[in-house]
């Protein structure tokens, strides 16, 4: 696992403990909370990051209208169960034996139940819509410049293959980034769109997961882009199953 050899740290995940105890004295890093070894040459899975976080102290419009099945992460933080690959287990339960099913980004997609609740498979989130509102600037951003900058960001900072950034929409002051990645499209070694979106969200909140970095401050053609608010919508390959009671 690639880690900075000189001082043995994990460039892509500051929520790790690293030591030169790998094969041949190589630097090896383990995620806080789970103790699982992580690959520091790529992003760490959201499940392991959430676990580490819980263990740590502390019309003719170009904009997309999220579908009726889009999920927003309203439940917030919880201590997840992760599988040996670091993915979310389909069923999550809390200490009081309340259980629910989650999608591949760990967002609840069913009503809460008890220990008898079954979650047959981990449903993949194949479409993520990141909705940003920016603060007033010297002028509207040029759409193509903005598009290029955000695509560059996801490619260089989050190592997400460009084909998974489906579109960047802009209607001042709203910016929308669409990420799409079907199960069939995701090859071994590809960064998951859910992980890239989570790293981006934490960056915007000034809580960068990268070693030795603060938040992410974007600029487009020199112009500072100051984000006012962020909303993230998640669309699953199979629509979520909530009772009508929740929908009203």
């Amino acid at each position: 696992h690639t880690a900075a050899q000189d001082n043995c740290t994990c460039p892509t995940n500051k929520m790790t403990v690293c030591s030169p105890d790998g094969p041949g004295g190589r630097c090896q890093c383990r995620a806080l909370g789970s103790g699982m070894a992580v690959d520091c040459s790529t992003l760490t899975s959201k499940c392991l990051l959430l676990k580490a976080r819980m263990s740590a102290p502390k019309n003719a419009r170009t904009l997309v209208r999220p579908s009726e099945h889009a999920l927003v992460d309203n439940d917030g933080l919880y201590d997840p169960d992760c599988d040996p690959e670091g993915r979310f287990k389909a069923r999550q339960c809390n200490q009081t034996s309340v259980c629910w099913c989650v999608n591949s980004v760990g967002v609840r997609r069913t009503d809460k139940g008890d220990l008898s609740l079954r979650c047959d498979e981990l449903v993949r989130t194949h479409h993520i819509l990141i909705d940003l509102r920016h603060r007033p600037t010297a002028g509207a951003f040029n759409h193509s410049d903005l598009d290029a900058e955000l695509r560059r960001l996801f490619r260089e900072r989050y190592r997400l293959h460009p084909k998974f950034v489906a579109a960047v929409h802009y209607e001042q002051p709203t910016i929308q980034i669409e990420l799409r990645q079907n199960t069939s499209q995701k090859a071994a070694g590809d960064v998951d769109i859910g992980d890239a979106a989570y790293y981006f969200e934490r960056d915007i909140k000034g809580e960068s997961l990268f070693q030795g970095r603060g938040g992410l401050d974007l600029r487009v053609r020199g112009e500072p882009l100051q984000v006012e608010r962020t909303l993230i919508y998640y669309l699953d390959e199979i629509p979520p199953k909530f009772s009508m009671k929740r929908l009203t």
Epitope: R135, A138, G139, D217, R219, G222, Q226
Partner: antibody, heavy 119, light 106 residues
């Protein structure tokens, strides 16, 4: 290395205008905005606004709208700040500053230009 | 506008002392906080950005912490060259500075 060099001290009469220059070197001028910050004697630093030399777009602190005008000249890699209708309240040191390469904090500063308004 | 309130406004300390300066924002600034040092007749110098990231060449005795609305600058062992005025600045929503903290020799 990155440098911002400002014009010299000015003494002006009330009601007059003053134009301060900020010559940038050591980096691509159009890559970053230029901020202007003022500091009256014994007072806190006060952000006035910025200019984007890439497209001459400006953003001002509400307090300085109509009072200050920011311009730039790509050919000479120089930014300018003009303050009109000077009063004794405008006596201050005026700084230009460039943002940090990774954040919106201000990493490189000019040496400052003292503007004194006196009758 | 976001208001930044620094405290104390001044303090007297001796070489070797541990010094702490706090800065409170009127709303959450999501770690978009910088600390500057300014000496008389000089321009401010950036010490820390992103609330905690030390700038290149800044001695490790300087450190920043905090989140949300509350932030702290700590000088672990004050050196003669550290006597100066320190300002915090938020850059989450435009740019505003605290009123400054003057660190004087006791």
């Amino acid at each position: 290395q990155v440098q911002l060099v400002q014009s010299g001290a000015e003494v002006k009469k009330p009601g007059a205008s003053v134009k301060v220059s900020c010559k940038a070197s050591g980096y691509t001028f159009t890559t970053y905005v230029i901020h202007w910050v003022r500091q009256a004697p014994g007072q806190r630093l006060e952000w006035m606004g910025y200019i984007n030399p890439n497209n001459d777009g400006t953003k001002y602190n509400e307090k300085f709208k109509g009072k200050a005008t920011l311009t730039s000249d790509k050919s000479s890699t120089t930014a300018y700040m003009e303050v009109r209708g000077l009063t004794s309240e405008d006596s201050a040191v005026y700084y230009c500053a460039r943002p940090h390469f990774e954040t919106h904090a201000m990493d490189y500063w000019g040496q400052g230009t003292l503007v004194t308004v006196s009758s | 506008d976001i208001q930044m309130t620094q405290s104390p406004s001044s303090l007297s300390a001796s070489v070797g002392d541990r010094v702490t300066i706090t800065c409170k924002a009127s709303e959450d600034i999501f770690n978009r906080l910088a600390w500057y040092q300014q000496k008389p007749g000089k321009a401010p110098k950036l010490l820390i950005s992103g609330a905690t990231s030390l700038e290149t060449g800044v001695p490790s005795r300087f450190s920043g912490s905090g989140s949300g609305k509350d932030y702290t600058l700590t000088i672990s062992s004050l050196q003669p060259e550290d006597f100066a005025t320190y300002y915090c600045q938020q850059y989450w929503n435009t740019w505003t500075f605290g009123q400054g903290t003057k660190v004087e020799i006791k």
